[in-house]
């Protein structure tokens, strides 16, 4: 590249410059001028700028800053953003397979269960769902309820078919039965500790993605102070009032400047690291019951064997209920 | 007992869990999403460098601007870089950081907090018959009568990972039957599903 | 890659508007600068003004200025540019063009151009 | 305000011969602030030179531009076919803020 010509005469080329971000020449002095009043581009000699320039140049440094760290980050900001999404939407997929899983296993094995059983496999899903999107749910409670609500429908269509329907005073009695004989042996017990694992690790998988997005999105939109936009100022512009427009900042000045300006961001550095190693260790231990894929495609067949195992001491259990809620059954047989 | 018929019904639609070679699964797709992420461990400490090197800065050219007058490239003039009498670089630095990085510095330790907790192996301690030697084996916990057998007649146990972009594209219907998962290896110690 | 792709031809009666688009895709729009030329048929290019979104300023060269009106939609990565009271001698194909910066300051090359809206 | 006179208007020359266009400011330019651009019919220019003399990416090394003041020129070496078009110079930084010859066929 030539090297830069001698300073501008009239400050002509100054204007036409300045001119571009500031339409109106009112600011840029006709020629070359003291420059007593600058504060920035403190000059050496005479100089085409003035104070109100000078403003305008700092507003521009900090905007241009602004678009550097941008497209600094634009590639790790879309590489996190792209992943929340799609394992948000991957996680949802899962979550209506194994809905659908869990209902055919009714329909196909249990058909008299089937339409009480959906609905109560559709709002224990839903409560998966909302969890994992970081809804205030307690898992226990979400299988709980799941088991509570089964059982009066297994107990009334497969254990006892001859109960007349809908009765609800039965209904609560079984519903205390179910965890007091813990009729479902340890099952409950089992899903609850793989999904509250899975969801979990799913849950807060999916908070560190986004919380990653919230790093970049301050990390791009930061406020330099004003003694950085002094310094971008000088580094990139103070050329221009001596008619200097294609010229680059040394190399190591760049660097300096910037190391001042960033000194603040560069603190997350430390945390930054730890963020990506840690979540890499809670990647690596996302198998089996810490597995969200696995866990809940995998539940409609605990579910099944829950249920075989009522079915298998169904003959114990009517004689125990039979006397624990005959109370209810009374007042249902009048 | 109940058992799994070889083809599923559901709104007269069959399950069919179809075997797909080497796509991509939710786990490997983690797993490649980390390693893109460690390539940027160093984002904020590289960053200032990267600024420069990607604005223009004199590399090929004499003559460098160093805030107060073009001089040679390599002289003293442009490594003292025109910031003496200017501002106090090390005063700009020992300002600390602002507010908003501090709040999500803040936010950050409290992540990899829970990160290290979920990750850590005594987190990971469960009853032995919950895990590796329980329900999933079909071995038996201490009180024989909830011992749990295997998963019923016929049930052939299949472990299931969900097809990942093709379960992405895939958008099933609430009530549909499960589709377009592969089938795996049968494998003994793995969490059941259907088999095709 | 930056591309700019602008509006189809139109065929304007004299004294109303036109209005031309410019979209850009690829890069940082709001820092590019984007000028607009126009060429009459079988004559030279010709300089109408142009703007940095960033700062949403406009320049118009003295011929052009209180006729042509030239905007930026930060959102849509889109300019426009829109001329008014037009004459028979506005017929020509009319170009956007990103200008090479530094530091947001247009330097005046135009190095991406559209392909013209006729 | 400046204008740019470029001469010839027309130059006719056959392939492997060398073509060396010229550009005249009315008023002192920057040489940082002359360009060069090319345009075939129905298509947009291109810009081909920059700043006096450096070329842009993707340029063939037969282009090349030189001088300063108010005298600048356009060298193409060793003419190819596809070199046929009208060749534009551009200054910025002087009332009119961009100014374009009339152009070298």
């Known amino acids: 590249q030539p090297p830069p010509p001698p300073p501008d005469a009239t400050c002509h080329q100054v204007r036409s410059f300045f001119q571009r971000l500031q339409p109106g020449l009112k600011w840029v002095p006709e020629t070359p001028v003291p420059g007593s009043d600058l504060q920035v581009c403190l000059p050496k000699g005479p100089t085409c700028c003035s104070r109100k320039m000078e403003e305008k140049y700092q507003l521009t440094a900090r905007l241009n800053m602004e678009q550097l760290l941008q497209s600094a980050s634009m590639e790790l900001k879309f590489l996190i953003i792209q992943n929340a999404a799609v394992f948000q939407e991957a996680f949802e997929i899962v979550v209506r397979h194994a809905k659908n899983y869990t209902n055919a296993m009714f329909k196909n094995n249990y058909p008299s269960l089937t339409p009480q059983a959906f609905e109560f496999v559709g709002e224990f899903f839903t409560d998966v769902s909302l969890y994992i999107l970081g809804s205030d749910i307690n898992v226990d409670d979400m299988v709980n309820e799941l088991f509570d609500s089964l059982f009066p429908v297994i107990y009334t269509q497969l254990m006892n078919p001859g109960l007349p329907d809908s009765a609800l005073d039965i209904n609560e009695c079984l519903r205390g039965a179910r965890r007091d004989l813990k009729v479902f042996g340890n099952f409950p017990k089992l899903i609850m500790t793989q999904v509250s694992k899975s969801l979990q690790v799913t849950r807060i998988f999916l908070q560190a993605l986004n919380l990653g997005i919230e790093v970049i999105n301050t990390t791009d939109h930061l406020k330099f102070s004003k003694d950085c936009g002094r310094m971008l100022t000088r580094m990139w512009y103070c050329s221009y009032c001596q008619g200097l427009m294609m010229v680059k900042p040394c190399g190591g000045y760049c660097n300096v400047v910037m190391q001042g300006c960033m000194a603040g961001v560069v603190e997350i550095d430390k945390y930054w690291r730890e963020y990506i190693l840690s979540l890499e260790e809670l990647v690596n231990g996302m198998y089996r019951i810490y597995d969200m894929e696995n866990v809940l495609l995998g539940l409609f067949s605990t579910i099944h064997d829950s249920i075989q195992y009522v079915q298998k001491n169904a003959g114990k259990l009517t004689t125990t209920i039979g006397k624990l809620c005959a109370h209810s059954q009374q007042r249902q047989y009048r | 007992s109940a058992y799994y018929p070889e083809d599923l019904f559901i709104d007269k639609k069959v399950l069919k869990v179809a075997h797909v070679e080497h796509e991509e699964t939710l786990s490997s797709r983690r797993r490649e999403l980390i390693q893109k992420l460690k390539s940027f461990i160093s984002f904020y400490s590289a960053l200032p460098g990267y600024i420069c090197s990607h604005s223009p800065v004199a590399e090929n050219d004499t003559l460098c601007w160093n805030g107060q007058e073009l001089v040679e490239r390599y002289s003293q003039k442009a490594a003292r870089n025109g910031m003496k009498n200017q501002f106090n670089l090390h005063e700009l630095k020992m300002k600390g950081p602002e507010p908003v990085v501090s709040q999500i510095i803040d936010k950050l330790k409290h992540i990899n907090q829970l990160l290290r907790t979920m990750s850590m192996p005594k987190g990971r301690v469960l009853d032995k018959n919950l895990d590796e030697e329980g329900f999933e084996s079909g071995d038996c916990g201490d009180d024989e009568d909830e011992c749990i057998g295997g998963s019923g007649d016929g049930m052939i146990k299949v472990k299931n990972q969900l097809r990942f972009l093709a379960e992405l594209a895939y958008d099933l219907d609430v009530d549909d039957a499960p589709g377009n998962s592969q089938q795996a290896t049968p494998k003994d110690n793995e969490i059941s599903t259907f088999h095709n | 890659e930056v591309q700019l792709v602008q509006s189809g031809a139109e065929v304007k009666k004299p004294g109303s508007s036109v209005k031309v688009s410019c979209k850009a895709s690829?890069?940082?729009?709001?820092?590019?600068?984007i000028s607009w030329v126009r060429q009459a048929p079988g004559q030279g290019l010709e300089w109408m003004g142009g703007?940095?979104?960033?700062?949403?300023?406009?320049n118009y060269a003295q011929k052009f200025q209180g006729r042509v009106t030239i905007t930026a939609d930060k959102s849509t990565s889109t300019a426009y540019m829109e001329l008014s009271s037009l004459r028979s001698e506005d017929t020509a194909v009319y170009y956007c063009a990103r200008e090479w910066q530094q530091q947001l300051v247009p330097l005046g090359y135009m190095d991406v151009w559209g392909k013209g809206t006729t | 305000e400046t204008t740019l006179t470029q001469s010839p208007g027309t130059l006719s020359l056959s392939p492997g011969e060398r073509a060396t266009l010229s550009c005249r400011a009315s008023?002192?330019?920057?040489?940082?602030?002359l360009a060069w651009y090319q345009q075939k019919p129905g298509q947009a220019p291109r810009l081909l030179i920059y700043?006096?003399?450096s070329r842009t990416t993707g340029v063939p090394d037969r282009f090349s531009g030189s001088g300063s003041g108010t005298d600048f020129t356009l060298t193409i070496s060793r003419l190819e076919p596809e070199d046929s078009a009208v060749y534009y110079c551009q200054q910025y930084g002087y009332s009119p803020l961009y100014t374009f010859g009339q152009g070298t066929k």
């Open positions: 703007i940095i979104p960033i700062f949403g300023t406009a």
């Open positions: 690829g890069g940082t729009f709001s820092s590019y600068a």
């Open positions: 008023h002192s330019v920057s040489s940082n602030f």
């Open positions: 700043a006096a003399s």
